[in-house]
Interface confidence: medium
């Protein structure tokens, strides 16, 4: 495979509801019809897989039913949304793109998006 450039934003702030969205864009050197996108989380020196989806170009991304990720694709861009985030999930989220079909196989790994998650302040009890 040839190296493939993957671009993603450096920093994203999650919403107060624990939702973070970012775009993962890849410069496809081939005419891929089948693409696999994986979101990896790097914390300290540990890298874990957050979610992954395989899709046909022009079709929707399909994550597993219990996945915390959703996404849409448009050309060489994938719009990824990660839900259910809490402060402890703050970290570097890396977009990995693989062009699976047709051969040759291409692999691209982004530099990562630092997602900051701030847990909302609990509402003060109101006395009536």
């Amino acid at each position: 495979c040839k190296a493939m450039h993957v671009a993603q934003p450096a920093v994203v702030l999650a919403s107060s509801r624990g939702i973070a969205s970012f775009v993962c864009e890849y410069a496809s050197p081939g005419k891929a019809t089948e693409v696999r996108v994986t979101v990896l989380r790097q914390a300290d020196s540990q890298v874990t897989e957050v979610c992954a989806a395989t899709y046909m170009m022009g079709n929707e991304l399909t994550f597993l039913d219990d996945s915390i990720c959703t996404g849409t694709s448009s050309g060489n861009q994938v719009n990824l949304t990660i839900q259910g985030l809490r402060a402890m999930d703050t970290g570097l989220y890396i977009c990995k793109v693989e062009l699976m079909y047709p051969p040759p196989y291409y692999l691209g790994i982004g530099n990562g998006t630092q997602i900051y998650v701030i847990d909302p302040e609990p509402c003060p009890d109101s006395d009536f």
Epitope: A3, E34, A52, M100, Y101, P103, P104, L107
Partner: antibody, heavy 115, light 111 residues
Framework: QVQLVQSGAEVKKPGASVKVSCKAS????????FTWVRQAPGQGLEWMGW????????DYAQKFEGRVTMTTDTSTTTAYMELRGLKSDDTAMYYC????????WGQGTTVTVSS | QSVLTQPPSVSGAPGQRVTISCTGS?????????VHWYQQLPGTAPKLLIY???SRPSGVPDRFSGSKSGTSPSLAISGLQSEDEADYYC???????????FGSGTKVTVL
């Protein structure tokens, strides 16, 4: 853990066909395709082709085009490679491997072609 | 005859460093396609050792390293151990054959 288990050894006559199976477990089957590679006795590795488990698309090495068929069965998470018109120089160990990157391999299936 | 050429054999004493080259042409390595390396221990299936020229899958010791300087990829094994005795193959895409091609293979012997 991720595992690929292949069918047992086969002995075939010249002109016959052989169908090798590769049962996958430990990962989402449709997320990765299968590469098939063979190795003649005492020789190097030879790429035969690739199949997508996602939609069944195939890409075969020119050498095997018209003689090989690769398929997958999502219901049983199994990949198959059928080679027709066997000749003595098809005697080899046949391997399946996960994905085009071949990050996990089956244990191999010995196919002997002899009259 | 393989499209990618490797030395038939290399050897070294335990603890030494050995390198294996993989030479291709303008339709494969020279065209910029990545090189992957596989290790095949005697009597076993091959195992992915290095992908994308220099990346190591988890579980592969850091004694193994891949590099690609221009059009000359190589695999290095430092701190050679007896369990490294195996055949090593490089792999790249060839755009004229429209197929993946393996190198001829290199047998590593630990003296």
């Amino acid at each position: 853990q991720v595992q690929l288990v292949q069918s047992g050894a086969e002995v075939k006559k010249p002109g016959a066909s052989v169908k090798v199976s590769c049962k996958a477990s430990g990962y989402i089957f449709t997320s990765y395709g299968f590469t098939w590679v063979r190795q003649a006795p005492g020789q190097g590795l030879e790429w035969m082709g690739w199949i997508s488990s996602y939609n069944g698309n195939t890409d075969y090495a020119q050498k095997f085009e018209g003689r090989v068929t690769m398929t997958t069965d999502t219901s049983t998470t199994t990949a198959y490679m059928e080679l027709r018109g066997l000749k003595s120089d098809d005697t080899a160990m046949y391997y399946c491997a996960r994905g085009p990157q071949m990050d996990v391999w089956g244990q191999g299936t010995t196919v002997t072609v002899s009259s | 005859q393989s499209v990618l050429t490797q030395p038939p054999s290399v050897s070294g004493a335990p603890g030494q460093r050995v390198t294996i080259s993989c030479t291709g042409s303008s339709s494969n390595i020279g065209a910029g396609y990545d090189v992957h390396w596989y290790q095949q221990l005697p009597g076993t299936a091959p195992k992915l050792l290095i992908y994308g020229n220099s990346s190591r899958p988890s579980g592969v010791p850091d004694r193994f390293s891949g590099s690609k300087s221009g059009t000359s990829p190589s695999l290095a094994i430092s701190g050679l151990q007896s369990e490294d005795e195996a055949d090593y193959y490089c792999l790249s895409w060839d755009e004229s054959l429209n197929a993946y091609v393996f190198g001829s293979g290199t047998k590593v012997t630990v003296l």
